[in-house]
């Protein structure tokens, strides 16, 4: 896999062992945690990242558990189950035996329940809405402007095909990011929606999961871009299912 | 008023590396907006090369990514372009522009540089 | 990589004429708020000069003879009534994806 070939790195993961033992000498990086093989000349699945954030010693993590908002993803940080090729496996349990199961976003969609629990398939978060407050400016920002830097941004920074990049909704000082992406549109090589949102999540946080680059420093014409709060909405291509109970809660 | 201005040697041998610099005055490479270079073979039409944004990342077009690097040295608000193994194919006239929103409304008046022997 | 192709290669026509140039993306280079595509001229040993940035907007300080429009894949730059200056070649440039890419260019001549 593609790597910083001098000295060894992972640009787009930082989260990773790497060594010159891959074929030919070439180096190969992999995630800590789940010891997978990474492709670098990508972002690495969501999945794969949580994993390593949880192997993480817990002295060394500065990172912090996101906010529990509702309708976002409540159950925070866990240490998930991947497949082979580095997602997200349907079903998610814990230490006690608790299961539930998840999107390809690894958020939770079900009621918890016991090892009994089937989930059938991993279905696929087909739209993600980031929503975006900024800090005052001097004035509001140009529309037309910022729905261009911030697609440049998913574009440049994240690889992620400008054509999934649905919409930029602005009314001062909101700002909404929307993403689309169905199994049939995405193809192979494609980065997925929940990745790059991720990815854009921490950078938002100040916890840049890209090797060696410096934070986020966003500018829509020389004025900086400072996000004060996020929130992430995911939508599956399958409704969730979950009791009245909790949705009454 | 934003100028740029284009500096380098005008012939390069085959197989050697071309190094461009455009220097900027009336804006701060630094404070925003992204920083490109872009060619035109004589008698052709453009071909956009890459940028280095005001935080100092680049992108590149992929058909001369392996050969390309653009550079900055912000205390003198200037950026470089450096193309290396160059064969005749490379002679062009080499403009720097800067890109506002993803489109170029400051140009240098070029460079030409010719490759060689 | 997104291919621009603009029609004519070239055209000529007469000072005070009614000038259409075309240029058509291979894939759409619009957002719903942005049109990518951009319009600059250039004339003989000169760089080229932005005339209309995002499909329809007039730099500043072109002259209102000059406008865009289209949206897509298919746009159009219009020369209201042909100047002297106006005799030069014209490029549009897309920058939805990379690689930025720019159309073939469209010589206008003095007929």
């Known amino acids: 896999h593609t790597a910083a070939q001098d000295n060894c790195t992972c640009p787009t993961n930082k989260m990773t062992v790497c060594s010159p033992d891959g074929p030919g000498g070439r180096c190969q990086c992999r995630a800590l945690g789940s010891g997978m093989a990474v492709d670098c000349s990508t972002l690495t699945s969501k999945c794969l990242l949580l994993k390593a954030r949880m192997s993480a010693p817990k002295n060394a993590r500065t990172l912090v558990r996101p906010s529990e908002h509702a309708l976002v993803d409540n159950d925070g940080l866990y240490d998930p189950d991947c497949d082979p090729e580095g997602r997200f496996k349907a079903r998610q349990c814990n230490q006690t035996s608790v299961c539930w199961c998840v999107n390809s976003v690894g958020v939770r969609r079900t009621d918890k329940g016991d090892l009994s629990l089937r989930c059938d398939e991993l279905v696929r978060t087909h739209h993600i809405l980031i929503d975006l407050r900024h800090r005052p400016t001097a004035g509001a920002f140009n529309h037309s402007d910022l729905d261009a830097e911030l697609r440049r941004l998913f574009r440049e920074r994240y690889r992620l095909h400008p054509k999934f990049v649905a919409a930029v909704h602005y009314e001062q000082p909101t700002i909404q990011i929307e993403l689309r992406q169905n199994t049939s549109q995405k193809a192979a090589g494609d980065v997925d929606i929940g990745d790059a949102a991720y990815y854009f999540e921490r950078d938002i946080k100040g916890e840049s999961l890209f090797q060696g680059r410096g934070g986020l420093d966003l500018r829509v014409r020389g004025e900086p871009l400072q996000v004060e709060r996020t929130l992430i909405y995911y939508l599956d291509e399958i409704p969730p299912k979950f009791s009245m109970k909790r949705l009454t809660a | 008023q934003v100028q740029l201005q284009e500096s380098g040697p005008g012939l390069v041998k085959p197989s050697q590396t071309l190094k461009l610099t455009c220097t900027v005055s009336?804006?701060?490479?630094?404070?925003?907006?992204?920083w490109n270079w872009i060619r035109q073979p004589p008698g052709k039409g453009l071909e956009w090369i890459g940028y280095?944004?005001?935080?100092?990342?680049?992108l590149y077009n992929p058909s001369l990514k392996s050969r390309v690097t653009i550079s900055r040295d912000t205390s003198k608000n200037q950026f470089s372009l450096k193309l290396s193994s160059v064969t005749a194919a490379d002679t062009a006239v080499y403009y720097c522009?800067?890109?506002?929103?993803?489109?170029?409304?400051?140009w240098g008046q070029g460079t030409l540089v010719t490759v060689s022997s | 990589d997104i291919q621009m192709t603009q029609s004519p290669s070239s055209l000529s026509a007469s000072v005070g004429d009614r000038v259409t140039i075309t240029c058509r993306a291979s894939?759409?280079?619009?957002?719903?708020?942005?049109?990518?595509l951009h319009w600059y001229q250039q004339k003989p040993g000169k760089a080229p000069k932005l005339l209309i940035y995002?499909?329809?907007n007039l730099e500043s300080g072109v002259p209102s003879r000059f406008s865009g429009s289209g949206s897509g894949t298919d746009f159009t730059l219009t020369i209201r009534s042909l100047q002297p200056e106006d005799f030069a070649t014209y490029y549009c440039?897309?920058?939805?994806?990379?690689?930025?890419?720019f159309g073939q260019g469209t010589k206008l001549e003095i007929k």
């Open positions: 995002r499909a329809s």
């Open positions: 280095i944004s005001y935080s100092g990342r680049n």
């Open positions: 440039q897309q920058s939805n994806e990379d690689p930025y890419t």
């Open positions: 894939e759409s280079v619009s957002s719903s708020v942005n049109r990518f």
């Open positions: 009336g804006y701060s490479i630094s404070s925003g907006y992204y």
């Open positions: 522009a800067r890109d506002t929103t993803a489109y170029f409304d400051y």
